[in-house]
């Protein structure tokens, strides 16, 4: 006797159809379908269509949201950090005049020790340990771009608060194009949001690893809390295993 | 003969204990659990205990994420439009000058219309159809917030497009607020991004609804085109059926 | 949500996640895995009763359609809702390695 | 991913998602709904064999873990992954309604 | 900016050889590989090899092994590729093409490639 | 060695219209959920210039009315308003596999 049970196609088609029919009257709310017995003639009014694809069209939009690759998922990712150039390279010297920005540097040959492959690289977090806060502020993140030209990526609106908090800032597609093709020093800046017609656009935000005057015996906790890159890669000889995906089974 | 099943709860229990043994060597590509043998006596060094905190702490801020009520999810959300205000309104005139913003304002009455309870509201969307655009530029959405201040409320980088393309901002929370206590007419802004070091602050993009000297024969479509909120709501008769989410079953 | 909050505070029957923790030590037998000693995995089980059929009497069913089959499926099945991730430290030879995880513990489960 | 592009061009017999088009009309004998007439609402369908014990050579199975159950569940079942929404047009008396259904369409599936 | 600037055209007799060079600026030339590839009169592109300017590591498309030799000169920035035993079917254009960082590199610079046409 | 086959060989459109161009792989070319599929666009007398890196990545400074798509054996390189200064041939390339491939070219005309 066979225990192999044969799946009839057919009967599982019937029951995902029945269980439909439940499903939208049941998002529907109704007991059954609603009668038809005062709809007006003719096509569907102009308004109910164009309204009717502007729906569509948002859902077109959502799907077109590329799917992430399961394989690359699953495996486990090693976790490095690159802690920022400190404050005293030379490379500070020139971005040390503005009261709207600070600067964090990074060496790209430590980000490239941490991850060898721009590729396997699954995810890159910028963390900053922000202090005591006494307003509400609008932060913006600029990654640098070209000699002097900042390119925008991110803002966060921070609200008051008396003890210290991570802030972390999703920089994988920045920290990807810096391992593939960065200079040897790369960075980012952080800024007060300036509004076209706003006049105070200090940054208020005290982030730890650029406050000066600190007592000596804080200096170790400070730099070990300045701001740092979390990476997550999957490593070399582990992406080498994986099958290729032709083959799913 | 009863042909209930008791399930076997300890059965259950070690079959999961078994597979995740296997879930984690597989994510870690090991077919044994690593040798030990050289593994350095003593407690992790602190750099090592510093990541693993860092990782978890990303965790935890990850899962602090609210989950969207699935009993509000599953029921059908009727969909709706309300049209900006037309620009020869008013209200429109204390805010023409500005070469670096468009406004677009709301009559709030015919959103409680559409929505007549504010908790009611899943989703609202303002979408504005831009036209062509030789440069690329970075916008911010504000709200209108109180005389004459505006709340940040999120941005879009708009990359050159030879083609028309409709922008799709998420503005649930401000149109709820609305909603729940908003004036007679409510508005957003939409301006050019301002660095604080850059000059050239002007709005480029040309939104369909503002643009002046059009052909008659196009004023029709372009009015239809022209700026909407798109919203989606469960209808009230809907939500009064709604369980109690006490009682889950 | 068919999540902690709910499901370890109740007696429910139907699909809900069900606690589990995993002692790396004593349920698996592994020393290798210097942190966490052990992690809250979890489980879901429960039935997740086919409600649907041309004989079945709409009204009735349809408070309960959300919960036993709310994605139509031909046999719905209680399956992970939310899941989180899970860090750990472990040796490769004489270096330490901290590695993510992914999918590791549920939080909620769900009928699909 | 166990998804359209795959599953409709492969003879998996494992979980994939499988096409199936519900034509309102024919299929349900609904006039009700004036758009859209139907809609690709596929299912997920499939075996996900339960690959771990003790006694399973640990090496072999480490390549299929993956697919055949990636959340280590004790009975790992095939299950919709991806899902979208669809948007409908049906009158309640004179009055036409646009209406939008949550996670009606299946776009892949998975084993969990 | 990034630049790759290559060595003149080149006239060659048959079973001569030929080195065409590559010199890089504005980028730290070491942190790249660098690949050569061939482009006959009215064909398509192939991949001849690459090279570690840092380490002088080398990959050669099989076809390529006993024609080309790559080299680098770090104190210049510069990279070589000899092409030996020459005959007719080597003439062609030559260019040398920076691979972003990694093993798995594409190519996003290219010089503005070397003609060597060989003629009796 | 990995094949690409590019097809068609030569393709004319006209002006404004949309020219598609495929590479098909002999194997996959992902690693990673990353597809390492490369498009260049050479006019006559001209180095390759870089369009698309990673299937669909854009090039700074190329035009978005070049975009990449497709995965693991099978891509698409899109010219959704096809212009004068378009016309050229294009090469796809992968860099999953030593000896890298390129794919024969296509050669776009205006119709």
């Known amino acids: 006797l066979s225990t192999c049970k044969t799946i009839d196609m057919e009967l599982v088609k019937r029951k995902r159809i029945e269980a439909i029919r439940g499903q939208i009257l049941s998002k529907l709310r109704l007991a059954s379908p609603p009668s038809q017995g005062e709809v007006p003639p003719g096509p569907l009014p102009e308004a109910v269509l164009a309204l009717y694809n502007s729906t569509r069209d948002r859902v077109a939009g959502e799907s077109a949201e590329p799917e992430p690759e399961p394989e690359a998922d699953y495996y486990a990712k090693e976790v490095t950090r690159v802690l920022m150039v400190e404050t005293h390279n030379e490379i500070y010297d020139k971005f040390k005049q503005s009261t709207h920005s600070i600067y964090m540097f990074f060496n790209t040959s430590e980000l490239r020790e941490a991850v060898p492959e721009p590729v396997l690289l699954s995810r890159a977090e910028l963390r900053l340990l922000r202090l005591k806060l006494k307003v509400e502020q609008h932060v913006e993140l600029y990654q640098k771009y070209s000699n002097n030209s900042w390119r925008y990526l991110s803002n966060r609106l921070l609200a008051p608060s008396d003890s210290p908090e991570w802030l972390s800032f999703d920089v994988t597609g920045v920290v990807r194009q810096w391992l593939s093709r960065g200079g040897e020093i790369e960075g980012f800046r952080l800024s007060a949001h300036c509004s076209c017609d706003s006049r105070d656009n200090t940054l208020q935000v005290d982030i730890n690893g650029f406050t000066t005057g600190r007592r000596g015996d804080l200096a170790t906790i400070h730099g070990m809390n300045r701001p740092f890159l979390l990476l997550m890669a999957t490593p070399l000889e582990r992406a080498q295993h994986l099958q290729s995906s032709r083959h799913r089974r | 003969l009863s042909t209930c099943k008791t399930i076997d709860m300890e059965l259950v229990k070690r079959k999961r204990i078994e597979a995740i043994r296997g879930q984690i060597l597989s994510k870690l590509r090991l077919a044994s659990p690593p040798s030990q043998g050289e593994v350095p006596p003593g407690p992790l060094p602190e750099a090592v205990l510093a990541l693993y905190n860092s990782t978890r702490d990303r965790v935890a801020g990850e899962s602090a994420e609210p989950e969207p009520e699935p009993e509000a999810d599953y029921y059908a959300k009727e969909v709706t439009r309300v049209l900006m205000v037309e620009t020869h309104n008013e209200i429109y005139d204390k805010f023409k000058q500005s070469t670096h913003s468009i406004y677009m304002f709301f009559n709030t009455s015919e959103l409680r219309e559409a929505v007549p309870e504010p908790v009611l509201l899943s989703r609202a969307e303002l979408r504005l159809l831009r036209l062509k655009l030789k440069v690329e530029q970075h916008v911010e959405l504000y709200q209108k917030y109180s005389n004459n201040s505006w709340r940040y409320l999120s941005n879009r980088l708009l990359a050159p497009s030879d083609s028309p393309e409709w922008l799709s901002f998420d503005v649930t929370g401000v149109v709820r607020q609305w909603l729940s206590r908003g004036g007679e007419i409510e508005g957003f802004r939409l301006s050019a991004h301002c660095s604080c070091d850059s000059r050239d602050n002007t709005l480029q993009v040309d939104i369909n609804g503002f643009t002046t000297g059009r052909r008659g024969d196009l004023a029709t479509i372009h009015g239809m085109n022209r700026p909407f909120l798109l919203l989606m709501a469960t209808p009230l008769e809907r939500a009064q059926h709604l369980q109690s989410s006490r009682h889950r079953r | 949500a068919l999540d902690t909050n709910y499901c370890f505070s109740s007696t429910e029957k139907n699909c809900c996640v069900r606690q589990l923790y995993i002692d790396f030590r004593k349920d698996l037998g592994w020393k290798w895995i210097h942190e966490p000693k052990g992690y809250h995995a979890n489980f879901c089980l429960g039935p997740c009763p086919y409600i649907w059929s041309l004989d079945t009497q709409y009204s009735k069913v349809l408070a309960l359609y959300n919960q036993h089959n709310p994605g139509a499926s031909a046999a719905p099945c209680c399956v992970p809702q939310a899941l989180e991730p899970l860090p750990i430290v472990y040796y490769v030879g004489r270096k330490p390695k901290v590695e993510q995880l992914s999918n590791m513990i549920v939080r909620s489960c769900k009928c699909s | 991913a166990l998804d359209t592009n795959y599953c409709f061009s492969s003879t998996e017999k494992n979980c994939c998602v499988r096409q199936l088009y519900i034509d309102f009309r024919k299929d349900l004998g609904w006039k009700w709904i004036h758009e859209p007439k139907g809609y690709h609402a596929n299912f997920c369908l499939g075996p996900c064999p339960y690959i771990w014990s003790l006694d399973t050579q640990y090496s072999k199975v480490l390549a299929l873990y993956n697919q055949h159950n990636p959340g280590a569940s004790a009975a790992p079942c095939c299950v919709p992954q991806a899902l979208e929404p669809l948007p409908i047009v049906y009158y309640v008396g004179r009055k036409p309604k646009v209406e939008q259904l949550s996670n009606m369409i299946v776009r892949s599936c998975k084993c969990s | 900016q990034v630049q790759l600037v290559q060595s003149g055209a080149e006239v060659k007799k048959p079973g001569a050889s030929v080195k065409v060079s590559c010199k890089a600026s504005g980028y730290t030339f070491t942190s790249y590989w660098m690949h050569w590839v061939k482009q006959a009169p009215g064909q398509g592109l192939e991949w001849i090899g690459n090279i570690n300017p840092s380490n002088g590591d080398t990959n050669y498309n099989e076809k390529f092994k006993s024609k080309a030799t790559l080299t680098v000169d770090k104190s210049t920035s510069t990279a070589y590729m000899e092409l030996r035993s020459l005959r007719s079917d080597d003439t062609a254009v030559y260019y040398c093409?920076?691979?972003?960082?990694?093993?798995?590199?594409?190519?996003?610079?290219w010089g503005q490639g070397t003609l060597v046409t060989v003629s009796s | 060695d990995i094949v690409l086959t590019q097809s068609p060989d030569s393709l004319a459109v006209s002006l404004g219209e949309r020219a598609t161009i495929n590479c098909r792989a002999s194997?996959?070319?992902?690693?990673?959920?990353?597809?390492?599929i490369q498009w260049f666009q050479q006019k006559p007398g001209q180095p390759p210039k870089l369009l698309i890196y990673h299937a669909s990545n854009l090039e700074t400074g190329v035009p978005d009315r070049f975009s990449g798509s497709g995965s693991r054996t099978d891509f698409t390189l899109t010219i959704s308003s096809l212009q004068a200064e378009d016309v050229a041939v294009y090469y796809c390339l992968q860099s999953r596999q030593i000896p890298r491939t390129f794919g024969g070219g296509t050669k776009v005309e205006i119709k």
């Open positions: 194997e996959s070319v992902t690693i990673i959920g990353t597809n390492l």
């Open positions: 093409a920076r691979a972003t960082y990694g093993s798995y590199g594409y190519f996003d610079v």
